[in-house]
């Protein structure tokens, strides 16, 4: 079926529209376009004869139409009057006619709107404001935005006049915002510049600061007044009802007891005509002056400088007191007090000496404290730490390294890759890394005050595949029943599974075995000699699986209670005595012998030829393990009988 499609359907004035013909029959004689919904010779736009390829304008032709061989009609430079229906009349070769109708609508391009207001300075809780979006345009939709958000739901907000007018009833200071209106039609949308609503309000009840009302004679009184107000309030001060000055701050130096009284702040808003007041009562006491601390060095360098803090003023027959971190002074060889306690010296300051420090002057009734003083100890930079600790990254991820070194003032950071300076930032970010980003990453931390620099170098490897892992241990020779051992599978890599085996078996369930750090660390608590086994770690990621070489744990143990062999205790005179001592121990223990408490030789075997009854007594074997620091011993009684006096005696070795 012959159809007409308008592209576009909604057309902006001045633009063009194409009436596109679908399913045009074959074997045509010609066709004509007409304005309207029917064929009317008076409203013919253009005709076209296929045989001659001749286009003939009709009465409705405006010079803006172009007809194409496929019968489609292009109308250029569209005007409002072009809106409506268009009919295509097709004459086939057999002179049978066919018709189809299409339509489009014309809309103007909207101008940029503006906002008019009936009240430029509304008063809070009193006035209403009506915003109107200009100009008024037919077939346009109006929208409103407050702080670039759509209108909130509120009973105080009302849209009228086809949404062209936005009314805010009983304005509040929170209505101070950016307002925009927007006009839309099917072919355009335009937004106005923002209008800021200036709501007059206040003054609220003023606040007087500081809040404290008790002062010492000789101090300065500095009171500040503030009241929320638009436009800003004008301030006046009254003391005991007498006007003093029209300022926001009231300053009276070196006050006396006579300055005690009621202090009133009055806030006035000239636009709203409102006044508000607040009263505070000030009491001045006659007391000694407040102490303060002076320092001979405001920026001491760690491990280099000493600092002397002195409590001022110097007053005869006065007791001076000191506090550090709100505690009395700790006992330390680095803290020294002068004879009168007025000067506190810190020798060779450290970063932990920042304080705060306070001194006090004791009088009859109380202790007056100074303001706290904090020392600005310059230190560092320490060796920088690069995080995260991964050394392997897979291609395609983002590399984000952060460097931190303890330092005061804060360190300035630089990054180098393979020795080439990259940037002077604390963080280094490289997106979508490849194998080419493998290399030595150096973070340099510099302290501008001390002039010191420290660097840390990290090797980064970018590879889909992980390397053969290795096991690091925090304790290569742990002591039985005492030490813990933490095995860590290296390297640390993202998106990696870590696995462990002991003697080729998966980990046994034991309360002494603990996996942590994403299974990368295996901790054995309270090791025993049975833990001396082969430990293997494995790593697995998306493309690779690999195992470490085994690490055998060397557990130090013993010495256990020794055993003396042979077990015989009775010998015949003339026999040889050959005693051997053995104790389970790692490493092998040192042996020594005592006979009747007298030290003998430092050997594992004790040999005495041709014993006699004089060799009767106690034979003690002593074992010591220098590695574990442990000792053990056993005592055996030996009886030697005269030859032939007792049957069943050992003949000895």
């Amino acid at each position: 079926k012959l159809t007409i499609e308008s592209t576009p359907f909604n057309v902006a004035e001045g633009k063009e529209v194409l009436l596109l013909v679908h399913n045009l029959p074959q074997h045509l004689f010609g066709y004509s376009w007409y304005k309207g919904e029917r064929v009317d010779g008076n409203r013919q736009i253009i005709g076209y004869v296929i045989g001659t390829q001749q286009a003939t304008p009709g009465p409705a032709y405006s010079g803006r139409e172009i007809i194409y061989p496929n019968a489609s009609l292009l109308i250029q430079n569209i005007i409002q009057n072009d809106t409506g229906f268009y009919t295509l009349h097709v004459i086939k070769s057999d002179l049978v006619n066919e018709e189809a109708t299409g339509q489009f609508r014309v809309y103007p391009e909207l101008p940029k709107p503006s906002i008019s207001s009936n009240n430029s300075k509304p008063v809070e809780d009193k006035d209403a404001v009506a915003f109107t979006c200009e100009p008024e345009t037919q077939d346009a939709t109006y929208l409103w935005w407050v702080n670039n958000q759509s209108l909130p739901v509120s009973p105080r907000l009302q849209l009228s006049n086809g949404n062209r007018t936005l009314t805010l009833f009983n304005v509040t200071r929170n209505d101070t915002a950016s307002y925009k209106c927007e006009t839309q039609n099917p072919v355009s949308a335009r937004r106005s510049d923002s209008v800021i609503l200036n709501v007059l309000y206040g003054p609220d009840a003023p606040t007087i600061s500081p809040l404290n009302t008790s002062y010492r004679s000789g101090e300065n009184l500095n009171l500040s007044c503030h009241a929320a107000s638009n436009p800003p309030a004008q301030y006046s001060w009254f003391v005991n009802g007498t006007f003093q000055q029209s300022t926001q701050e009231l300053f009276i130096p070196n006050i006396t007891v006579n300055n005690s009284g009621s202090y009133t702040c009055q806030a006035h808003n000239s636009d709203t005509g409102l006044n508000r007041t607040t009263v505070t009562t000030i009491t001045v006491y006659a007391e000694p002056p407040k102490p303060f601390i002076t320092s001979n060095n405001s920026n001491p360098v760690e491990d280099e400088d000493a600092v002397a803090l002195t409590c001022e003023p110097e007053i005869q027959n006065t007791t001076y007191l000191w506090w550090v971190n709100n505690q009395s002074l700790p006992v330390s060889p680095r803290l020294q007090l002068s004879n009168d306690n007025r000067t506190l010296t810190l020798l060779s300051v450290t970063r932990n000496d920042v304080g705060p420090y306070e001194c006090g002057i004791q009088n009859e009734l109380s202790v007056d404290h100074s303001d706290p003083v904090i020392l600005n100890v310059l230190y560092g930079p320490d060796d920088p730490t690069i995080s995260p600790s991964y050394t392997y990254y897979r291609p395609g991820v983002n590399l984000s390294l952060s460097c931190h070194a303890a330092s005061n003032p804060p360190a300035q950071y630089s990054w180098l890759i393979d020795g080439n300076i990259q940037q002077h930032t604390q963080e280094l970010f490289i997106s979508n890394i490849t194998e080419k980003n493998s290399g030595l990453y150096t973070c340099q931390a510099n302290n501008s005050a001390s002039g010191h620099s420290r660097t840390t170098v990290k090797t980064i490897t970018v590879s889909a595949e992980l390397p053969k892992p290795s096991i690091s241990s925090n304790n290569s020779k742990p002591v039985e029943d005492k030490d813990a051992v933490a095995f860590t599978c290296e390297p640390e890599a993202q998106n990696t599974t870590y696995l462990w085996w002991v003697n080729g078996q998966s980990l046994p369930v034991s309360p002494r075995l603990q996996l942590s750090n994403g299974n990368r660390t295996l901790t054995l608590f309270n090791v025993t000699r049975n833990d001396a086994r082969a430990y293997v770690c494995g790593i697995q990621n998306s493309v690779s699986a690999n195992r470490s070489d085994p690490v055998t744990l060397d557990v130090l143990y013993g010495p256990d209670t020794p055993i003396i062999s042979p077990p015989d205790s009775s010998y015949l005179s003339g026999a040889n005595l050959n005693l051997s001592c053995h104790s389970a121990s790692n490493p092998s223990p040192q042996y020594s012998w005592r006979i009747n408490g007298i030290p003998q030789q430092h050997t594992q075997v004790l040999f005495i030829a041709k014993i006699t009854p004089n060799n009767n007594g106690t034979y003690a074997c002593f074992v010591s393990n220098l590695a574990t620091g442990r000792n053990n011993s056993i005592v055996k009684s030996i009886t030697v009988s005269a030859s032939g006096t007792s049957p069943g005696l050992s003949a000895g070795a």
Partner: antibody, heavy 120, light 106 residues
Framework: EVQLVESGGGLVQPGGSLRLSCAAS????????MHWVRQAPGKGLEWIGW????????EYDPKFQGRATMSADTSKNTAYLQMNSLRAEDTAVYYC?????????????WGQGTLVTVSS | DIQLTQSPSSLSASVGDRVTITCSAS?????MHWFQQKPGKAPKLWIY???NLASGVPSRFSGSGSGTDYTLTISSLQPEDFATYYC?????????FGQGTKVEIK
């Protein structure tokens, strides 16, 4: 015993699609990355990509990006490879494969392969 | 992409011969892995991480190399060793295989 069994191969028209399955037994596919590799008749091995069945993360050879889609159903312990817009040169045996450290030694397990023939 | 070039593409050898297959990478890789494939069968991991024999692989096989040049060696060829051998790199995406080396009976 670890086993991977592929299915879903067969004759496909040019321009058509196929969905291959790789059913795993003897292990949980959530714990391993599943790779797909293909081999055209008489030709070498060609890596297509991998999927992490636990979270659906994937990595493709760029030449298959857009035409191949890997997925997994952990409840069925099965991984899938969908190939679209098939051409004659996609005729190959398709294998699924895992690389694992389930024992103290790296192991590589492969399916038996499923033949896909693209022809009109 | 990292290209892997195996040589030779095929070789004929007798039982007992020493056979060496090389694999050259266009860019340095961490490790090379080797697979054995027999006709109609899936490939089998044969040597992993350059020099480690996979489970069940006879000790007459060995692997070596670093950087861009890697080698698979069979010290004394046995009848069951006749197959096609592929090298594979997993250092860089996409993972790539060599074109294969077919070991045939002379």
């Amino acid at each position: 015993e670890v086993q991977l069994v592929e299915s879903g191969g067969g004759l496909v028209q040019p321009g058509g699609s196929l969905r291959l399955s790789c059913a795993a037994s003897g292990f949980n596919i959530k714990d391993n990355y599943m790779h797909w590799v293909r081999q055209a008749p008489g030709k070498g091995l060609e890596w297509i990509g991998w999927i992490d069945p636990e979270n659906g993360d994937t990595e493709y050879d760029p030449k298959f990006q857009g035409r191949a889609t890997m997925s997994a159903d952990t409840s069925k312990n099965t991984a899938y490879l969908q190939m679209n817009s098939l051409r004659a040169e996609d005729t190959a045996v398709y294998y699924c494969n895992i690389i694992t450290m389930a024992t103290p030694y790296p192991m590589d397990y492969w399916g038996q392969g499923t033949l896909v023939t693209v022809s009109s | 992409d990292i290209q892997l070039t195996q040589s030779p593409s095929s070789l004929s050898a007798s039982v007992g011969d020493r056979v060496t297959i090389t694999c050259s990478a266009s860019t340095s890789v961490i490790y090379m892995h080797w697979f054995q494939q027999k006709p109609g069968k899936a490939p089998k991991l044969w040597i992993y991480s350059t020099s480690n024999l996979a489970s069940g692989v006879p000790s007459r096989f060995s692997g070596s190399g670093s950087g861009t040049d890697y080698t698979l060696t069979i010290s004394s060829l046995q009848p069951e060793d006749f197959a096609t051998y592929y090298c594979q790199q997993r250092s860089s995406y996409p993972l790539t295989f060599g074109q294969g080396t077919k070991v045939e009976i002379k």
